[in-house]
C-alpha cells in the first residue's frame, strides 16, 4: 500500500508542495489522515497527520467544546493507494475572529497562543489579547494547555492559550480517537503564563484546614469533593455544537458531541483539475470565522471546519 505522508503543525508541513508518498510496511492495509482544529475567540489553527495507518477504513468526525474553546477532530482511513488526501488540512488562521473591534473588551486579559510553536509560546512571550464576550458567552478566564494528535505512528502537539469561559478549571480535557485538547483555567490578568503545575485548589474552594482533634467526641463528617459533580449529557446533533443549558459546577466534565457529517465523495484525486478552489483538499479551506457564527457546522465539503466565507 502507498500512502501520502506529512505532518502539519499550525499551517505548515502539509502545505501543497511538501507532500510525500510512502510505501507501507507488511500488514498495513490502511492509509490514514487526521486533522484536529482548535478555535479560540482570537483565532484558529490545526494540526494534522497523513501516513500509513492501522485499523479499519472509515470516517470519524467530532465537535468538542472545552469551556468555550472549540475543537474539531476528523479522522479518515481508507484502503486504496494514496487515498488519504480527502480532508482539508489547510486551515486559515483567523486574523481576528470576525470584526473584533465590534466586540467590547470585558476587562480580562490573557496570553494567546494560536498556532504558535512551543518555543514562541513560553511564559510571557506570546501576545496578550483582550477577552470579550461572544455569542452570549462570557469569556473571562484564561487557558493554558495543549492540543495533541496521534495518528500514523506520529504524535504532534501544540500549545493552546487564550480566553475561556471558566476561570478555575484544572487539567480538564476533551478527547477524540487519538486527539486531546487539555489544560487549565485561571482568573486574573495574564494569569495563563504557565498552568502546567496547577493544583485543584482555587479561590472558590476553601483550602483543607487541619484542625486539632476535638476534646469531645463528635460524629465524623466527610467533605464532599467539589470536583466530583455529575455532568449532564450533551444532546447529540447532526448540525451544531450545543452547550447544555443545565447549570453546571465549574468542574463538570467537558461535553463531547458526535457529529454526523455528510461527506462529499465525488472529489477524487485522480484526474480532474488540481485542487480548484482550495489547497491540498477538496473545496476551500476554512475561512475567516466570526464567533457569532460558531454554532453552525458544515453539512458537506469533507467535514471542514465551519467557515464564514467558503469557496
Amino acid at each position: 500500500l502507498e500512502c501520502y505522508s506529512c505532518v502539519q503543525k499550525a499551517d505548515d508541513g502539509c502545505s501543497p508542495h511538501r507532500m510525500k508518498t510512502v510505501k507501507c510496511g507488511p500488514g498495513v492495509d490502511v492509509c490514514t489522515e487526521a486533522v484536529g482544529a482548535v478555535e479560540t475567540i482570537h483565532g484558529q489553527f490545526s494540526v494534522a497527520v497523513r501516513g500509513c495507518g492501522s485499523g479499519i477504513p472509515g470516517k470519524n468526525d467530532r465537535g468538542l467544546d472545552l469551556h468555550g474553546l472549540l475543537a474539531f477532530f476528523q479522522l479518515q482511513q481508507c484502503s486504496e493507494d494514496r487515498c488519504n488526501a480527502k480532508l482539508n488540512l489547510t486551515l486559515r488562521g483567523l486574523n481576528p475572529a470576525g470584526n473584533e473591534s465590534a466586540y467590547e473588551p470585558n476587562g480580562a486579559e490573557c496570553y494567546s497562543c494560536v498556532g504558535l510553536s512551543r518555543e514562541k509560546c513560553q511564559g510571557s512571550m506570546p501576545p496578550v489579547v483582550n477577552c470579550y464576550n461572544a455569542s452570549g458567552r462570557v469569556y473571562k478566564g484564561c487557558f493554558d494547555g495543549n492540543v495533541t494528535l496521534t495518528a500514523a505512528n506520529v504524535t504532534v502537539s501544540l500549545p493552546v492559550r487564550g480566553c475561556v469561559q471558566d476561570e478555575t478549571c484544572t487539567r480538564d480535557g476533551v478527547t477524540g480517537p487519538g486527539f486531546t485538547l487539555s489544560g487549565s483555567c485561571c482568573q486574573g490578568p495574564r494569569c495563563n503564563a504557565d498552568l502546567r503545575n496547577k493544583t485543584y485548589f482555587s479561590p472558590r474552594i476553601p483550602p483543607l484546614v487541619l484542625l486539632p482533634p476535638p476534646t469531645t467526641a463528635a460524629p465524623s463528617t466527610r467533605a464532599q469533593n467539589s470536583s466530583s459533580t455529575t455532568s449532564t449529557a450533551a444532546p447529540t446533533t447532526t448540525t451544531s455544537i450545543i452547550k447544555p443549558t443545565t447549570a453546571q459546577a465549574s468542574h463538570t466534565s467537558p461535553h463531547e458531541m458526535d457529529l454526523e457529517v455528510i461527506q462529499e465523495e465525488g472529489a477524487s484525486l485522480s484526474g480532474g483539475a488540481a485542487g480548484h478552489g482550495g489547497t491540498a483538499g477538496h473545496g476551500g479551506a476554512a475561512g475567516h470565522q466570526d464567533r457569532s457564527n460558531m454554532e453552525k457546522y458544515p453539512g458537506k465539503g469533507g467535514a471542514q471546519i465551519p467557515a464564514k466565507g467558503g469557496s
Partner: antibody, heavy 117, light 112 residues
Framework: EVQLLESGGGLVQPGGSLRLSCAAS????????MSWVRQAPGKGLEWVSY????????YYADSVKGRFTISRDNSKNTLYLQMNSLRAEDTAVYYC??????????WGQGTLVTVSS | ESVLTQPPSVSGAPGQRVTISCTGS?????????VHWYQQLPGTAPKLLIY???KRPSGVPDRFSGSKSGTSASLAISGLRSEDEADYYC???????????FGGGTKLTVLG
Amino acid sequence: EVQLLESGGGLVQPGGSLRLSCAASGFTFSNAWMSWVRQAPGKGLEWVSYISSSGSTIYYADSVKGRFTISRDNSKNTLYLQMNSLRAEDTAVYYCAREGLWAFDYWGQGTLVTVSS
Amino acid sequence: ESVLTQPPSVSGAPGQRVTISCTGSSSNIGAGYVVHWYQQLPGTAPKLLIYDNNKRPSGVPDRFSGSKSGTSASLAISGLRSEDEADYYCAAWDDRLNGPVFGGGTKLTVLG
C-alpha cells in the same frame, strides 16, 4: 475562471526597489497558498517565495532572502512581492502562481523586472 | 546549476514517443516528495501538465504521462504533435533548500 494578474514590473537601477502585485480572482484567495516564481531571459524557472493562506508561514529562496518580502492582503485578493537591494541577476519575468494539489496549478502572465544602470 | 537535472533538449517526429528524465537526490525526489511537470509554450506562462507524479489536470490529453522511481522521474509524451513543441520543467520540494525546486528545463522539438 481563475485569473492571476501581475503588475508593478519595470526598469530599476541596481540597489533600487520595486513592489510587485498579483490580483487574484475566480477562486477563494484566502484559502490558497501562493508563490512567486521567476524566469530570467532565456533561462529556466526559479522559485522565489512562498506564503501560506493566512500569511503566517513564509519561505524564501536563498538567493533573495533578506532582500525580498512576500505578503498578502486577503481582503483585497492580492499577493505582493517587495523587492529591495535589487541586483542585475534579479532581472526576470516574475510570475505569481497558486498552489493546488501539491503543484502550481495556475500561473499569471508574468511581469518583467529589469535591473540595469 | 539546477537541483533537478533534465536533458537540455529532446526531439522526435510526429506520432513518435519521447521521454524526458528528471534526476534528483535524497533531499527531494528521493525523500519521497511528489514530482510535477510543467509545459511552457513559447512566449507564454508555464502550465501544469502532470502533478503528484502521474496525475493529469483536466484538459491535459492522456498522451502525457508521468512516473517516478527512486530519485528520478520521467515524463512520457506519445503520439507527438507539433503543438507539443515547448519547454518542459519538472519540480519537487527540496528539504535542504526548504522550498520547491525546478529542473533546468528540456526543450522539445517536433521534427518535420
